[in-house]
């Protein structure tokens, strides 16, 4: 889904009833610690020397919904995610580095503590480099491990 074309229909009130108390996780992992803004996430990443994982998604996108479920239910991904600064966004930031090849959802971009966007860590789709589908959990897990191997930091 390309959010530059259409940002999704209004959320149906019937679909909006929270099953659990609403948290910053938005269903991507209620046991994980999520940051609220990109600025906060960058600060936390830099000061804690942990990579940042940014998930762009939309409530009204079937593929965002589907990826969210497998992400939240994947025990290994959830465990590995504890080593990241985490941010999920339902809106686009002004930082164009977070959309190297377009503003589609869902997409997952990693940022190094040196505040370098890891454009080299991509999914399997050549037309949407940072897209992942439910069948791509093994690749996403591998990419998370890649992101944990930090770029050389300045002394």
């Amino acid at each position: 889904k390309d959010t530059t074309v259409k940002s999704g229909a209004k959320k149906d009130p019937k679909d909006s009833r929270p099953k659990l108390p609403q948290t910053l996780s938005r269903g991507w992992g209620d046991q994980l610690i999520w940051t609220q803004t990109y600025e906060e996430a960058l600060y936390r990443s830099k000061t804690s020397n942990r990579p940042l994982m940014v998930i762009h998604h939309l409530d009204e996108c079937p593929h965002s919904q589907a990826l969210k479920k497998v992400f939240a239910e994947h025990k290994e991904i959830q465990k590995l995610a504890e080593q990241f600064v985490l941010l999920n966004l339902v809106y686009e930031t002004t930082d164009k580095h977070l959309s190297p090849d377009g503003q589609y959802v869902p997409r997952i971009v990693f940022v190094d503590p040196s505040l370098t966007v890891r454009a080299d860590i991509t999914g399997r789709y050549s037309n949407r480099l940072y897209a992942y589908e439910p069948s791509d959990t093994a690749l996403l897990y591998d990419n998370m491990k890649k992101a944990l191997k930090l770029l050389k930091t300045e002394l």
């Epitope: 259409k6 099953k19 269903g27 079937p62 593929h63 589907a66 239910e73 949407r128 439910p134 069948s135």
Partner: antibody
Framework: QVQLLESGGGLVKPGGSLRLSCATS????????MNWIRQAPGQGLEWIGW????????NYNGKVKDRFTLSADKAKNSVYLQMNSLRAEDTAVYFC?????????????WGQGTLVTVSS | EIVLTQSPDFQSVTPKEKVTITCKAS??????LSWFQQKPDQSPKTLIY???RLVDGVPSRFSGSGSGQDFTLTINSLEAEDAATYYC?????????FGGGTKVEIK
């Protein structure tokens, strides 16, 4: 193997209600999206909505969202379509169809359908 | 909502002939398109998903192609058992929508 079995169809008067069931077996029920689709006599297919049985998340076609409600019972491996304020134009065969085995949105497997007739 | 336009509506084909059915979306749907086969008084059967991926157990004479707005279902060397109505479905965006169907008849 995967099995989906719809039931609960029948004749109902305009304004009436009906609850359809889709009993499933042969796969991990809670981890695949379940869709409902209908087909009016001699017509094409229309998507009604989907539910994720793991947590009950739903999304509906705007044409029916005020009258139709999806639910799931993990203990019974079944999903339900509650239809209220039925109209003649709701007359159709109603199918449940499972999403991809890996949690993907594509429709992988269909039940045989149950006929709902709305008539006075 | 996204509109899918299928063509032709009807096709009469001799066995072993090649059949091509097209599905055009009213907007870009990436590769999120499926094809279904429905025989009279039966439920639909999924043939293809993600535009070109063949479902397990579906004969290799069926294939799908396309991305963006234009998609094609091809049946190479049609067999008598392939007489059916074929539907496309987009699952890129809610509500999911189907094409109007293409009825394939054996001459």
């Amino acid at each position: 193997q995967v099995q989906l079995l719809e039931s609960g169809g029948g004749l109902v008067k305009p304004g009436g209600s009906l609850r359809l069931s889709c009993a499933t077996s042969g796969y991990v029920f809670s981890r695949s999206w379940m869709n409902w689709i209908r087909q009016a006599p001699g017509q094409g297919l229309e998507w009604i909505g989907w539910i994720y049985p793991g947590d009950g998340d739903t999304n509906y076609n705007g044409k029916v969202k005020d009258r139709f409600t999806l639910s799931a019972d993990k203990a019974k491996n079944s999903v339900y379509l509650q239809m209220n304020s039925l109209r003649a134009e709701d007359t159709a065969v109603y199918f449940c169809a499972r999403g991809g085995y890996d949690g993907s949105p594509w429709l992988s497997y269909w039940g045989q359908g149950t006929l709902v007739t709305v008539s006075s | 909502e996204i509109v899918l336009t299928q063509s032709p509506d009807f096709q009469s084909v001799t066995p072993k002939e090649k059949v091509t059915i097209t599905c055009k979306a009213s907007q870009d749907i990436n590769s999120y398109l499926s094809w279904f086969q429905q025989k009279p008084d039966q439920s639909p059967k999924t043939l293809i998903y993600r535009a070109n991926r063949l479902v397990d157990g579906v004969p290799s004479r069926f294939s799908g192609s396309g991305s963006g707005q234009d998609f094609t279902l091809t049946i190479n060397s049609l067999e008598a058992e392939d007489a059916a109505t074929y539907y496309c479905l987009q699952y890129d965006e809610f509500p999911f929508t189907f094409g109007g169907g293409t009825k394939v008849e054996i001459k």
